[in-house]
């Protein structure tokens, strides 16, 4: 009679995480008498998955009635598969004895587990940056298997090319992680922009996962300042305005200085929003010309988002203003940007 063979017909089986895996095994003879055991692995560190003779294996069920005397099908089903179940499974025939001795092993079935990547998490730089600067964004996704994965970066729908991607670990593993860093050049129009990381994997059936970062959390658009003088009003009062334009974020404090002395400090409140997401704000100062004997240097000083102050000055020529009411002589404007 021909010697018993253990046949595992499937060289490999691929299962999605959470599903059940069926591992097929048949023997060609009822002799020698003895139980079947299933192991993951073939070496000394192999793990017992199922023992026909004894033990409790809650995730394993036999496909056929393996307790029947004439049964030669020892296929098993393993429920609720996770990436940790990946490996090569061996159906092993033992010869009955005290103890039972290993008689013959099947060739093994490699179980691979398809696991979805986690939702990509995109993170930007810790500190804000200004237009024309290059900033880095990272994208991470974990827990996927198999290792093959595609990652793309977009800015407002336009694919980016300046990025580096690593999949870890390099060798075989039950599951993998991807980490990518993209470089993005900021522009003044980027307040409403988004950076998108897109991950495609076999488990996603053509519907990639996306992670986004809003550049509004990354960009700082510094304001431009313009100081102008309105026509002289009654009672020798001059209205000087400071136009603060195209800034982001809104956090802004303005200080008026008269000849270097603080006149008034205020925080931007009722701002107007531009189409590109930046803000405009205007502050004004009424200067009583008659109270000044000499020329007045008015400075609009703006501290934006905790950055060093920027300022713009305006020289108010007191000598050009007759002291009587109704004079509309324009004051001279010698604006200068100071930091």
């Amino acid at each position: 009679e021909e010697e018993l063979q253990v046949i595992q017909p499937d060289k490999s089986v691929s299962v999605a995480a959470g599903e059940s895996a069926i591992l097929h095994c048949t023997v060609t003879s009822l002799i020698p008498v003895g139980p079947i055991q299933w192991f993951r692995g073939a070496g000394p560190a192999r793990e017992l998955i199922y023992n026909q003779k004894e033990g409790h294996f809650p995730r394993v069920t036999t496909v056929s009635e393996s307790t029947k005397r004439e049964n030669m099908d020892f296929s098993i089903s393993i429920s609720n598969i996770t990436p940790a179940d990946a490996g090569t499974y061996y159906c092993v025939k033992f010869r009955k004895g005290s103890p039972d001795t290993e008689f013959k092993s099947g060739a093994g079935t490699e179980l691979s587990v398809r696991a979805k990547p986690s939702a990509p998490v995109v993170s930007g730089p810790a500190a804000r940056a200004t237009p024309q600067h290059t900033v880095s964004f990272t994208c991470e996704s974990h827990g996927f298997s198999p290792r093959d994965i595609t990652l793309k970066w977009f800015k407002n729908g336009n694919e980016l090319s300046d990025f580096q991607t690593n999949v870890d670990p390099v060798g075989e593993s039950v599951s993998y992680s991807i980490h990518s860093t993209a470089k993005v050049v900021l522009t003044r129009e980027d307040v409403h922009s988004q950076v998108i990381c897109e991950v495609a994997h076999v488990t996603l059936q053509g519907d990639p996962l996306r992670g986004t970062a809003n550049l509004s959390e990354t960009i700082r658009v510094p304001p431009t300042l313009e100081v102008t003088q309105q026509p002289v009003r009654a009672e020798n009062q001059v209205n000087v305005t400071c136009q603060v334009r195209k800034f982001y974020p809104q956090r802004l404090q303005l200080t008026w200085l008269e000849n270097g002395n603080v006149s008034r400090t205020e925080t931007a409140s009722t701002v107007t929003e531009n189409k590109d997401g930046t803000y405009n704000w205007m502050s004004w100062l009424l200067v009583n010309v008659s109270a000044h004997r000499d020329d007045v240097k008015l400075t609009c000083q703006v501290e934006h988002d905790g950055q060093p102050a920027v300022s713009k000055s305006h020289d108010l020529k007191v000598s050009a203003h007759p002291k009587e009411q109704g004079s509309n002589t324009a004051a001279e404007n010698t604006g200068s940007n100071e930091r």
Epitope: V6, G41, A42, G43, A45, T88, T101, E102, K104, S105
Partner: antibody, heavy 116, light 110 residues
Framework: QSVEESGGRLVTPGTPLTLACTVS????????ISWVRQAPEKGLEYIGI?????GASYASWAKGRFTISKTSTTVDLKITSPTPEDTATYFC?????????????WGPGTLVTVSL | AQVLTQTPASVSAAVGGTVTISCQSS????????LSWYQQKPGKPPKLLIY???TLASGVPSRFKGSGSGTQFTLTISDLESDDAATYFC??????????FGGGTEVVVK
């Protein structure tokens, strides 16, 4: 109690080569035979292992490049398509009697040279 | 992939001295103790010194001591003899059923 390798020789790249490991002086309920190689002046590199029932597993880099099989008298290592990088001394080693993965007994090794 | 990192690559000590070799695994070995140490001399096969992380193999002098668990292991050779000059390898066993070696440490006895 010993293991001994044989079959090492000079082969040209792409020519399959089978090495044999002969086990003598043992009557064991359970054992494992591993194949390990060592390139000249290099460290030890694990290839794969086979158990008494004939189930074999491999290092990830060795899958497809090597086949380990068991006959009634030997454990064979087939180098599927040798390249010059496979030039090394090939050892077989036996694990038995202790559930720790240690390789108790080693053969003297057989030299394989892959060259045009 | 599981990686075993041995340090140092080479160590020198005088007769009677002590040598310590470290072996770090990229992940825990099977049962936290599937770690063996081997000694190899030029032209010879490796010889098992320690198995199960700390158990001395038959015929190995007690000057050789293995310790550690999980991912960090140490081989200590005390009262160094000239015959101890050799290359020493650690080897791990993992639940993924692979049994790789560390890169080796050359011990020079002065």
């Amino acid at each position: 109690q010993s293991v001994e390798e044989s079959g090492g020789r000079l082969v040209t790249p792409g020519t399959p080569l089978t090495l044999a490991c002969t086990v003598s002086g043992f009557s064991l309920i359970s054992y494992y035979i591993s194949w390990v190689r060592q390139a000249p002046e290099k460290g030890l590199e694990y290839i794969g292992i086979i158990n008494i029932g004939g189930g074999a597993s491999y290092a990830s880099w060795a899958k497809g490049r090597f086949t380990i099989s068991k006959t009634s008298t030997t454990v064979d290592l087939k180098i599927t398509s040798p390249t010059p990088e496979d030039t090394a001394t090939y050892f077989c080693a036996m694990s038995y009697g202790m559930d720790t993965g240690a390789f108790n007994i080693w053969g003297p090794g057989t030299l394989v040279t892959v060259s045009l | 992939a599981q990686v075993l990192t041995q340090t140092p690559a080479s160590v020198s000590a005088a007769v009677g001295g002590t040598v310590t070799i470290s072996c770090q695994s990229s992940e825990s070995v099977y049962k936290n103790n599937f770690l063996s140490w081997y000694q190899q001399k030029p032209g010879k096969p490796p010889k098992l010194l320690i198995y199960g992380a700390s158990t001395l193999a038959s015929g190995v002098p007690s000057r050789f001591k293995g310790s550690g668990s999980g991912t960090q292991f140490t081989l200590t050779i005390s009262d160094l003899e000239s015959d101890d000059a050799a290359t020493y390898f650690c080897q791990g066993g993992y639940r993924t059923d692979i049994y790789p070696f560390g890169g080796g440490t050359e011990v020079v006895v002065k």
